[in-house]
């Protein structure tokens, strides 16, 4: 009788060990899935290169809060600048606040000095309204100083600490913006 009880106890213990092993495997699998999910989300937000180096912004990009910025080293017209940004998974800079404007102009002073940089702002030919590239309106303090008398399409650019306007077909540097990779901590 005692032997029978002892055998049952051993069987139960064996079962328990197997269950613990299964639980351990499941926990490991679940953790792996969670990690993969986080990686996928990160991958969709940014290109593979920045996901690999796990920093919020790719190399040669500047971070401020939730955004990464790239200051170009080449000149191009406004439309080509937009295409160049898209190739990097970004769009032309969209300035949402005075704080962001101050950060950009401060960074430009450190990097290159007083040059012209296209941003994602253009003037609608029919209404004359200024709109960011996603269709939203700039806040009142972020409207370009009327400087362009061009009959052609007019786009916005940053110079020193001002937002100005110019014929979109002129050549300037440009600034791209993308969302910073969210840390998974």
């Amino acid at each position: 009788k005692l032997l029978q009880v002892s055998t049952i106890a051993m069987q139960q213990q064996e079962k328990l060990i197997q269950q613990e092993r299964a639980l351990l495997n499941f926990t490991e699998w679940k953790r792996s899935c969670a990690l993969q999910m986080k990686y996928c989300q990160a991958f969709m937000q940014n290109s593979l290169s920045s996901a690999h180096n796990s920093s919020p912004c790719p190399n040669n990009w500047i971070q401020n809060r939730e955004s990464c910025y790239y200051v170009s080293e080449i000149w191009s017209i406004w439309h080509t600048s937009q295409e160049n940004c898209l190739k990097e998974g970004s769009t032309l800079l969209q300035i949402e606040s005075k704080e962001e404007m101050d950060f950009i102009t401060g960074s430009l002073r450190k990097i290159k000095g007083s040059y012209d940089y296209w941003v994602g702002l253009s003037q609608d030919g029919h209404s004359g309204r200024w709109l960011w590239q996603d269709g939203s309106s700039p806040s009142p303090g972020l409207l370009p100083a009327e400087r362009s008398q061009s009959a052609n399409q007019v786009c916005g650019y940053v110079k020193s600490n001002s937002l100005l306007s110019s014929n979109c077909s002129t050549w300037k540097y440009f600034i791209c913006e993308k969302y910073a990779l969210r840390s998974s901590v």
Partner: nanobody
Framework: QVQLQESGGGLVQAGGSLRLSCAAT????????MGWHRPARGNERELVAA???????TYVDSVKGRFTISRDNAKNTVYLQMNSLKPEDTAVYFC?????????WGQGTQVTVSS
């Protein structure tokens, strides 16, 4: 290599709506953004709308407030919802995939808006 297949074009009356789709296959991991283009003056293709992997969007002035670009990552598909269509929106719409090294184009889908 990336392959793009557009669909959803057709004939619609002014003020009507259409939804274009562009499905990407092949080396989709290299794609950083996708967009829709149409021929403009001099037959050069102008960017109508684009969306990045992070969800940032851009539109040409003439479609702002009427067109909306979106993406379904699970289906590797980008959509262009076109509302309040005008006769001047008539064109062949081409899907484009942006990668760091190369751009890929679809065959195009015809959109005709009658007045």
């Amino acid at each position: 290599q990336v392959q793009l297949q557009e669909s959803g074009g057709g004939l619609v009356q002014a003020g009507g709506s259409l939804r274009l789709s562009c499905a990407a296959t092949g080396d989709i991991s290299s794609i950083n953004a996708m967009g829709w283009h149409r021929p403009a003056r001099g037959n050069e293709r102008e960017l109508v709308a684009a969306i990045t992997n992070g969800g940032r969007t851009t539109y040409v002035d003439s479609v702002k407030g009427r067109f909306t670009i979106s993406r379904d990552n699970a289906k590797n598909t980008v959509y262009l919802q076109m509302n309040s269509l005008k006769p001047e929106d008539t064109a062949v719409y081409f899907c484009k995939a942006y990668t760091r090294d190369e751009d890929y184009w679809g065959q195009g889908t015809q959109v005709t808006v009658s007045s």
